[in-house]
């Protein structure tokens, strides 16, 4: 056969569908690869051909469109299963061609099983609701095109295994599920089951999504730098290790990029000729507020390094903040010699072993490897 533009296996379109449910799959060529739509292609005399490779097979074979009750059919650029079977899993190819033109793409289709609580290997979309924010809704996804607008389906909503009937703050309203006020306890998987008739048969569409309750924009604040702060002085002798944690709290903000960085004498650490390492850790609260800690470390600090300015910076969609760490060179304490080896002479050794940071105002000390919150 003549050359065909082969877009290969489009793994971005990892399509998962439930066993024994209708599925309509659009040929990805018109969605992502070609600059024209199916109607244009069709009126230009191009034909769309479908074929597939079964799971764990290499052999490409035509799709059987002559199954009882038209179980598999094609309509324009859509491949229909009414319904799917487990062994429909495989790689499907749609090819657009005429005598002078050919373009094709393959995509994987996985038919998955669900249990009575709608658990399955299906990757679930996540819908974020703001905590205590007033009425918010989720909508039963990906049901367009399955039935005409004249058909009135029945929709049943579930939370986990449980049909939502008398929930005190969650109300099913057709294709929508309304949360009167969202709390952390509303986190979980919600499923809509859409039941509709077609040609004397009844079909079910099952759609599950994960609800995650997140911090409200009403409560969002600019980044808060907990460390460094005015209560901690990093006092070191040359040759010691200098460790300064920068700990920043970020309110949850939808689609916000949270950034933390250090500057040394106003420059990025990479642009300074000293051996600095920076380690970052990130933790999240239940409402996805974020705490980022970047620990700046200089293994063997010099007296030059102890004169530099160390500033922690943070930025989110809510604003930018910065805080300088107080770094000093430790003045060696005078050595007391007391007859008989008793008295306070041992204090220097204790202080030396502790390698302390002074907390001004409080008189507390922490080991240098502790994070200061």
């Amino acid at each position: 056969s003549e050359r065909c533009d082969d877009w290969g296996l489009d793994t971005m379109r990892q399509i998962q569908v439930f066993e024994d449910e209708p599925a309509r799959i659009k040929c990805p060529l018109f969605e992502h690869f070609l600059k024209f739509n199916y109607s244009t292609a069709h009126s230009a005399g191009l034909t769309l051909i479908w074929y597939w490779t079964r799971q764990d097979r290499d052999l490409e074979e035509p799709i059987n469109f002559r199954l009882p009750e038209n179980r598999i059919s094609k309509e324009k650029d859509v491949l229909w299963f009414r319904p799917t079977l487990l062994n429909d899993t495989g790689n499907y190819t749609c090819m657009l061609r005429n005598t002078t033109y050919c373009s094709k793409v393959a995509f994987p289709l996985e038919v998955v099983q669900k249990d009575s609580c709608f658990n399955s290997p299906m990757k679930l979309p996540v819908h974020k609701l703001y905590i205590e924010y007033g009425i918010q809704r989720i909508t039963c996804p990906n049901v367009d095109g399955y039935f005409p607008s004249s058909v009135k389906p029945t929709i049943t909503w579930y939370m986990g295994c449980y049909k939502i009937q008398n929930f005190n703050n969650v109300i099913p309203e057709g294709m929508n599920l309304s949360f009167l006020i969202a709390f952390i306890s509303n986190n979980g998987n919600y499923t809509c089951v859409v039941t509709y008739p077609e040609n004397g048969r009844t079909f079910h569409l099952t759609r599950t999504l994960t609800v995650k309750v997140v911090g409200s924009p009403k409560n969002a604040v600019p980044p808060v730098i907990h460390s460094p702060n005015d209560h901690v002085v990093y006092e070191k002798e040359p040759g010691e290790e200098l460790l300064i944690p920068c700990t920043v709290y970020f309110s949850f903000l939808m689609d916000s990029r949270n950034e933390v960085w250090w500057t040394i004498d106003g420059k990025k650490p990479d642009d300074i000729p000293i051996d600095v390492t920076i380690n970052e850790s990130i933790s999240h609260s239940r409402t996805e507020d974020e705490t980022r800690t970047q620990i700046l470390s200089i293994k063997k600090v010099t007296s030059e390094d102890l004169k530099r300015s160390y500033v922690c910076h943070a930025r989110s969609a809510k604003g930018e903040v910065a805080k300088a760490a107080t770094v000093k060179q430790k003045v060696p304490a005078p050595r007391y010699t007391v007859e008989g080896g008793g008295g306070t002479g041992g204090l220097n050794d204790i202080f030396e072993a502790q390698k302390i940071e002074w907390h001004e105002g409080g008189g507390h000390h922490h080991h240098h490897h502790h994070h200061h919150h």
Partner: antibody, heavy 119, light 107 residues
């Protein structure tokens, strides 16, 4: 560790009511449904109904509809099962069991409460 | 409602032998089936869910199989602590229902 501690044994007269409690500890009370299952002497297990404490929704088996009420108090992490119009055939051990929302089997059970209905 | 029928009602087995317990559903429950063990004076204990998945801490001698309407619980080599009553439970449809139990006793 998860524990469900039920109230003590009860002896009741026919026609009266009984209210059995089930206090949960070790795990978020609001992340689970609490089910009630009973077992008559020498008999099998019989599912009665459930409550989802976080949402206040209770559902009952048809057989017990109108006679059973399941409630929950989130502040004390305690679920209650009240059975009214008691008859001798309600003599049984009543169990509460915890079920995560996304599963449908009973992973943790209370120790059981014997309710004896006798005149 | 779905009726679960267990057989036999009583199974007499010697320690170290294999025990095979049966559970039949009046209609398909897919793999939505659990097995429990109950000893006298105790609450039931979850052994198997999803027809074949062992619950946490359950020894490997317990195994479940089947789907649809026919299910089996197998205890490969009976230990003294395994003599008890075993129940199957379907959770495919509401109301969830139990079998009447199989008593495994010492032969």
């Amino acid at each position: 560790q998860v524990q469900l501690v039920q109230s003590g044994a009860e002896v009741k007269k026919p026609g009266s009511s009984v209210k059995v409690s089930c206090k949960a500890s070790g795990g978020q009370f609001n992340d689970y449904a609490i089910h009630w299952v009973r077992q008559a002497p020498g008999q099998g297990l019989e599912w009665m109904g459930y409550i989802i404490p976080a949402y206040g929704q209770a559902e009952y088996a048809q057989k017990f509809q109108g006679r059973v009420t399941i409630t929950a108090d989130e502040s004390t992490s305690t679920a209650y099962m009240e059975l009214s119009s008691l008859r001798s055939e309600d003599t049984a051990v009543y169990y509460c069991a915890r079920v995560p929302y996304s599963t449908a089997y009973f992973d943790y059970w209370g120790q059981g409460t014997l309710v004896t209905v006798s005149s | 409602e779905i009726v679960m029928t267990q057989s036999p009602a009583t199974l007499s087995v010697s320690p170290g032998e294999r025990a095979t317990l049966s559970c039949r559903a009046s209609q398909s429950v897919s793999s939505n089936l659990a097995w429990y063990q109950q000893k006298p004076g105790q609450a039931p204990r979850l052994l198997i869910y999803g027809a074949s998945t062992r619950a946490t801490g359950i020894p490997a001698r317990f195994s479940g199989s089947g789907s649809g309407t026919e299910f089996t619980l197998t205890i490969s080599s009976l230990q003294s602590e395994d003599f008890a009553v075993y129940y199957c439970q379907q959770y495919n449809n509401w109301p969830w229902t139990f079998g009447q139990g199989t008593k495994v006793e010492i032969k």
